[in-house]
Interface confidence: low
């Protein structure tokens, strides 16, 4: 004959444990039912009555089977630099992620605690490493033969065009200008191609410090155009 199924509450065998979705109530000394996600324990079990569960109130949740007396509060509303990617429901907390063009400088268990704007590389500098959801853009000076004339968190250094006759030589922040004869594209030295970010936001493995500067300050645009030839004093 099959073993008899015990209904909660029941006393476990000596040294035994309660079954899945049950917990051992120390006061009643019985195995009792847990409450499902979206509910909490309104009345704890006794030797003769099982746990009484109730739905979570608005703006509260439980994500797991539980026997908590109160549901957890959902996190505060997403800030202006974030978007809500998961709403607060009875079964899950609100999740806020950084909006496009920003990255998460300070993570929390789920979502992001603090967003910071992605660094923009100034003219003369290109993206060496795109930002990611949790890391800032890394800029690098454009190597000889390459340039970037934009202030951008996605643009890389591009090769100068090669002219039959050069009107104006290129530098790190400006392409070469050719006379009327048609130019050809150079194969510039050094790596100039870089994978573009998966999205505008998904672009520092750089160990993501908290933002080293307040949003919107000029310091987020780290370094500027063409480095000098060795020994020059700049402009």
């Amino acid at each position: 004959l099959p073993a008899q199924v015990a209904f909660t509450p029941y006393a476990p065998e000596p040294g035994g444990t309660c079954r899945l979705r049950e917990y051992y109530d120390q006061t009643a000394q019985m195995c009792c039912s847990k409450c499902p996600p979206g509910q909490h324990a309104k009345v704890f079990c006794t030797k003769t009555s099982d746990t009484v569960c109730d739905s979570c109130e608005d703006s509260t949740y439980t994500q797991l089977w539980n026997w908590v007396p109160e549901c957890l509060s959902c996190g505060s509303r997403c800030s202006s630099d974030q978007v809500e990617t998961q709403a607060c429901t009875r079964e899950q907390n609100r999740i806020c992620t950084c909006r496009p063009g920003w990255y998460c400088a300070l993570t929390k268990q789920e979502g992001c605690r603090l967003c910071a704007p992605l660094r923009k590389c100034r003219p003369g500098f290109g993206v060496a490493r795109p930002g990611t959801e949790t890391s800032d853009v890394v800029c690098k000076p454009c190597a000889p033969g390459t340039f970037s004339n934009t202030t951008s968190s996605t643009d890389i250094c591009r090769p100068h065009q090669i002219c039959n006759v050069v009107a104006v030589p290129g530098n790190a922040s400006m392409d070469a200008v050719c006379t009327s004869t048609s130019p050809t594209r150079s194969m510039a030295p050094g790596p100039v191609h870089l994978p573009q970010p998966v999205s505008t936001r998904s672009q520092h493995t750089q160990p993501t410090p908290a933002p080293s500067t307040a949003p919107g300050t000029s310091f987020l645009l780290p370094v500027g155009p063409s480095p000098p030839a060795e020994g020059s004093t700049g402009d």
Partner: nanobody
Framework: DVQLVESGGGLVQSGGSLRLSCAAS????????MTWVRQTSGSVFEWVSD????????RYADSVKGRFIISRDNAKSTLYLQMDSLKTDDTAVYYC?????????????WGKGTLVTVSS
Amino acid sequence: DVQLVESGGGLVQSGGSLRLSCAASGFPFSSSDMTWVRQTSGSVFEWVSDINPDGQNTRYADSVKGRFIISRDNAKSTLYLQMDSLKTDDTAVYYCAADPGSSGGSLSYWGKGTLVTVSS
């Protein structure tokens, strides 16, 4: 006349330390973003670190993070780069450069550089 003069470079054993200084004059140092950039033997320029005017905000390249510390003394108009646990890869000419804020975000002023050689 704008001047940026780097000093403190030299030959050092791998694992050793150096402190670079950059004495600035001729522009409003205390309101300028300051940057260290290095040029390797292959003529590749690499941004190393930068610091905002009040010295509270700093950034570092991955390759130097945890080993280099950028700082400044506005009263002396001097920028510093403390370099510890040096590696042979750190061998380069180190330039300090300034963004005085009026330049549209470019590094308008550059020093002549100081050579750092790290031997194994």
